[in-house]
């Protein structure tokens, strides 16, 4: 093995390099010194490094490592952040249009219901948006609330428009009757199934993307340990102490050091792989009733069908509701 | 069937986008994302190698630094000697991940569990969802024709499913991404604190 070239007799090269790292030359020895106080770049002979320089090298090494890590994840981070934003906005657009479709259906088919229907539809789709963004709302409750709110209006405006004002305190009964009489048939259940499935999947999809960002951010901003800092310093900077400015670390040595420094980070690998494969599986299943775009944009039609169902059974319903929502049966049996 | 509310979009931008020839649905966008993400599936296991390849490492030189001395690039000492009597690498590995990494691993485990439970079971015929989820016998009254059958997924083929192109604030064209593979920064553009 060839002997190392003799260190720069005046430490001049080392000084000029170090000046770029740390303006102010007072830390670099004029000439090589024994370096007995060094803890990382342990000298085999005279050295151009001081304890202060060593500390600066360690700091720089850890900083380099952090920057390398950030540049490594830049494209991945960009990909996920960008997509999370795109999908969130796209989902909001879908919700907005689904609301517009539904309002338009009411305006064109049931103009007498519109003022109140618009309000209930608006509240429903607001809840849909909040649910997608992670709000603690129950989808079945949202759908029930929509139909509970719509039915009294349908009953008083479409089925029984001549109802005297004195009878209008039956709204609460009508809300209850809506469920007990299964006024809308099985449409509410159908909508619950489709909306809850599609929204759950949409919500978990967004949650997963946001967690992806969190994972990258976490590993992006890792602070490396002192031990790692020492290993990196030895690999990248200790050669300078001997005046070996142009020498680069051995490849195998670099891999060993990096595996040591990144042992913790690499533990994420198994779960990261599983994350991507699980996300792929989820995405592959996001169609038909698991696709919120398909479900929400078709809601107006299902709601329309449900109102037609009520109208079809209006005669029988009106009779039953007349009994159930009477303040007392005894009025009828006197 | 319900009057289709095509002319009543409050957001006029949709009308502009709705008939674009090379339409892009949300589902195709999702699949595209997954394909891109899959190219990063080995991201974490490849990190050590990636960082070595993006920091100064002897490639064409005969001699390299092993942490203690100059050695020939292919000698055993190239990897081994530098570690001797210095730091116990095994100990460093044994310390286990930092608390923040452990936390993020726990979160990943949790989301993976959720993703698995939410995934549609393979082989499930979704076309039959009305039979599975829909009108139960007895719910439609005695007269069977009270049951409305036209409300399943079949009817949900909305004429123009939402397309989102120009109206999205973000454009995910590959050209916008800084590099289209995992090499985020070119090698000759090393981080400024390396002075080689």
């Amino acid at each position: 093995q060839p002997p190392p070239p003799p260190p720069d007799a005046t430490c001049h090269q080392v000084r000029s390099f170090f000046q770029r790292l740390q303006p102010g030359l007072k830390w670099v020895p004029e000439t090589p010194v024994p370096g007995s106080d060094l803890q990382v770049c342990l000298p085999k002979g005279p050295t151009c490094c001081s304890r202060k320089m060593e500390e600066k090298y360690q700091l720089t090494a850890r900083l380099n490592m952090e920057q390398l890590l950030q540049s490594a994840s830049m494209e991945l981070k960009f990909l996920i952040i960008q997509n999370a934003a795109v999908f969130q906005e796209a989902f909001e657009i879908v919700v907005r249009h689904a609301k517009n479709y539904t309002n338009a259906m009411f305006k064109n088919n049931y103009p007498s219901l519109t003022p109140q229907a618009f309000e209930f539809v608006g509240e429903f789709f607001t809840d849909v948006s909040l649910y997608i963004l992670g709000s603690d709302i129950n989808v079945d409750d949202m759908v029930n609330e929509l139909f509970d709110s719509l039915f009294p209006v349908i009953y008083t405006q479409l089925m029984n428009p001549g109802l005297p004002d004195s009878a209008l305190d039956i709204n609460e009964c009508l809300r209850g009757a809506r469920r007990d009489l299964k006024v809308f048939g099985n449409f509410p259940k159908l909508i619950m199934t489709q909306v809850s499935k599609s929204l759950q999947v949409t919500r978990i999809f967004l949650q997963a993307l946001n967690l992806g960002i969190e994972v990258i951010n976490t590993t992006d901003h890792l602070k490396f340990s002192k031990d790692c800092g020492r290993m990196l310093t030895r690999m990248w900077y200790c050669s300078y102490c001997q005046g070996l400015m142009m020498v680069k670390p051995c490849g195998g040595y670099c891999n060993v050091v990096m595996q040591g420094c990144m042992a913790g980070v690499v533990e994420i690998d198994k779960y990261w792989r599983e994350y991507i494969l699980s996300l792929e599986e989820l995405v592959n299943g996001m169609y038909r009733i698991y696709d919120m775009e398909n479900v929400l944009l078709g809601l107006f039609s299902t709601i329309h069908d449900s109102i037609q169902y009520v109208q079809k059974n209006a005669g029988k319903l009106t009779t039953t509701i007349g009994k159930l929502c009477a303040h007392s049966q005894q009025r009828q049996y006197r | 069937s319900a009057y289709y509310p095509e002319d009543l979009f409050i957001d006029k931008k949709v009308l502009k986008v709705a008939h674009v020839e090379h339409e892009e649905t949300l589902s195709s966008r999702r699949r595209e994302l997954i394909q891109k993400l899959k190219s990063f599936i080995s991201f974490y296991s490849a990190l050590p190698g990636y960082i070595c390849s993006h920091s100064p490492v002897a490639e064409n030189d005969t001699l390299c630094w092993n942490g203690q001395e100059l050695v020939e690039r292919y000698s055993q000492k190239a990897a081994r000697n530098g570690m001797k009597n210095q730091f116990n690498l095994h100990e460093l590995k044994m310390k286990g991940p930092e608390p923040v990494v452990s936390q993020i691993i726990d979160k990943l485990k949790h989301i993976n569990q959720l993703l698995r439970t939410m995934s549609v079971p393979k082989g499930r015929v979704l076309d039959k969802n009305l039979d599975e989820e829909g009108f139960e016998s007895g719910d439609c009254g005695d007269d069977e024709d009270e049951c409305i059958g036209g409300s399943g997924d079949g009817m949900m083929k909305v004429k123009n499913q939402l397309r989102f192109l120009a109206e999205l604030a973000y454009d995910l064209d590959v050209d916008d991404v800084p590099g289209n593979n995992q090499q985020a920064t070119p090698k000759d553009n090393e981080i400024s604190t390396f002075h080689n």
Partner: antibody, heavy 117, light 108 residues
Amino acid sequence: QVQLKQSGAELVRPGASVKLSCKASGYTFTDYYINWVKQRPGQGLEWIARIYPGSGNTYYNEKFKGKATLTAEKSSSTAYMQFSSLTSEDSAVYFCACSTYYTMDYWGQGTSVTVSS
Amino acid sequence: QIVLTQSPAIMSASLGERVTMTCTASSGVSSSYLHWYQQKPGSSPKLWIYTTSNLASGVPARFSGSGSGTSYSLTISSMEAEDAATYYCHQYHRSPYTFGGGTKLEIK
């Protein structure tokens, strides 16, 4: 005229179950709610649950969930309440009452349940 | 749950006397859902006054009911022997539906 006829008195062992019946006549059974109310000796009234026989929808007092199960048989215009895991606390008279959305108008004569070993 | 408190728990009145009993709810109850039942020993309760002020079928006109919000009352303008019984107020508004503890009316 509206009548609710309840099954006869029951003497049951602790831990056992009992199924009480309430047969309705004089009105359309599926059009009104059937409620069940408990009255312990010398005490007040306590609402247990109600069922809408037309759809089978049930509503329970949280206190009796898991204890009482309501069913209705349209063909015989009969409502049932199954009471399970009986203890001495369940010794009481149980009434069925038919109601609109607002009012319990008509009551059965009551069924006395005695839980004793 | 809505707690209904009846007072007095027991009262006695002479024949021909005016009688008033009250029912106080722990939170507001709509008058449409506040009712009174009469129960005599060994019998089932009978609907007596419904929706605060309406007399059930067969109830004598000497009975009346009033109130709103959290305060309701049942009044007998002139006590008669057949009126001796326990009277329960009841809210059928918010589940769990509840009854007051009862006012036992005796003849003095």
